[in-house]
Amino acid sequence: GPETLCGAELVDALQFVCGDRGFYFNKPTGYGSSSRRAPQTGIVDECCFRSCDLRRLEMYCAPLKPAKSA
């Protein structure tokens, strides 16, 4: 179920869940909000100060890197 994640526990969870994509501590500008003046929500606010489930954690994963040949 939902749990609070802080410090190393939060970084571990992000690293495992986001994997190769990496992650943000703040949602990218404009993510989930059309208002420029809306305060930026950070993962510490959402997952450390309040409980946080896996799906919310995934919202802080970075987008896929653009496909290019290795």
Epitope: E9, Q15, F16, G19, D20
Partner: antibody
Framework: EVQLVESGGGVVQPGRSLRLSCAAS????????MTWVRQAPGKGLEWVAY????????YYRDSVKGRFTISRDNSKNTLYLQMNSLRAEDTAVYYC???????????WGQGTLVTVSS | DIVMTQSPDSLAVSLGERATINCRAS?????MHWYQQKPGQPPKLLIY???KLASGVPDRFSGSGSGTDFTLTISSLQAEDVAVYYC?????????FGQGTKVEIK
């Protein structure tokens, strides 16, 4: 050198329980999250469960949720997998694994075989 | 979940010849990772980040690809390369592996 040694496997009847252990050495166990990965006989690899470095966060594959519990004792450098209500489809070699960022599933134990059969 | 499909399921190649294994993801991924599993042993990380060789891996192994299609190549098969090879995606939760490709000597 990273060493992971699993134990606790065996033959068990459907519906019964088993607890696997993984003794870790050669690295600072308490700094690393850990996972279990399993492999059914003659089949492929399947991630089973994750636990954060401090043990406060856990995730499970859907098929084991509510039946398996991953835990750890950082003072003993040991990882556990408590498996309840075992099913025939849980029959597999269970590996404990850990990762460095980008080096996913880089370190594996030798595995312990769990056979669920009546 | 992202489904990883490897082809072929098995492959017989003469010593010194090239072996090619393909892995297709059901959705685009950032990178592919490859593992080698010899009989009775745990898997071993072979290639990470699509094309980077893990420590101690001979340079006859190489990886390439992008998006949904990736390839592992053994340029000149040696007897010690007989194994099952698995691809892994870590771009989307949960981590998922391919079903494996068995490489044998012809």
């Amino acid at each position: 050198e990273v060493q992971l040694v699993e134990s606790g496997g065996g033959v068990v009847q459907p519906g019964r329980s088993l607890r696997l252990s993984c003794a870790a050495s050669g690295f600072t166990f308490s700094n690393y999250y850990m996972t279990w990965v399993r492999q059914a006989p003659g089949k492929g690899l399947e991630w089973v469960a994750y636990i954060s470095s401090g043990g406060g966060s856990t995730y499970y594959r859907d098929s084991v949720k509510g039946r398996f519990t991953i835990s750890r004792d950082n003072s003993k450098n040991t990882l556990y997998l408590q498996m309840n209500s075992l099913r025939a489809e849980d029959t597999a070699v269970y590996y404990c694994t850990t990762e460095d960022y980008g080096y996913w599933f880089a370190y594996w134990g030798q595995g312990t075989l769990v056979t669920v059969s009546s | 979940d992202i489904v990883m499909t490897q082809s072929p399921d098995s492959l017989a190649v003469s010593l010194g010849e090239r072996a090619t294994i393909n892995c297709r993801a059901s959705s685009s991924v950032s990178y592919m990772h490859w593992y080698q599993q010899k009989p009775g042993q745990p898997p071993k990380l072979l290639i990470y980040g699509t094309s980077k060789l893990a420590s101690g891996v001979p340079d006859r192994f190489s990886g390439s690809g992008s998006g949904t299609d990736f390839t592992l190549t053994i340029s000149s098969l040696q007897a010690e390369d007989v194994a099952v090879y698995y691809c892994l995606q870590r771009s989307s939760y949960p981590p998922t592996f391919g079903q494996g490709t068995k490489v044998e000597i012809k």
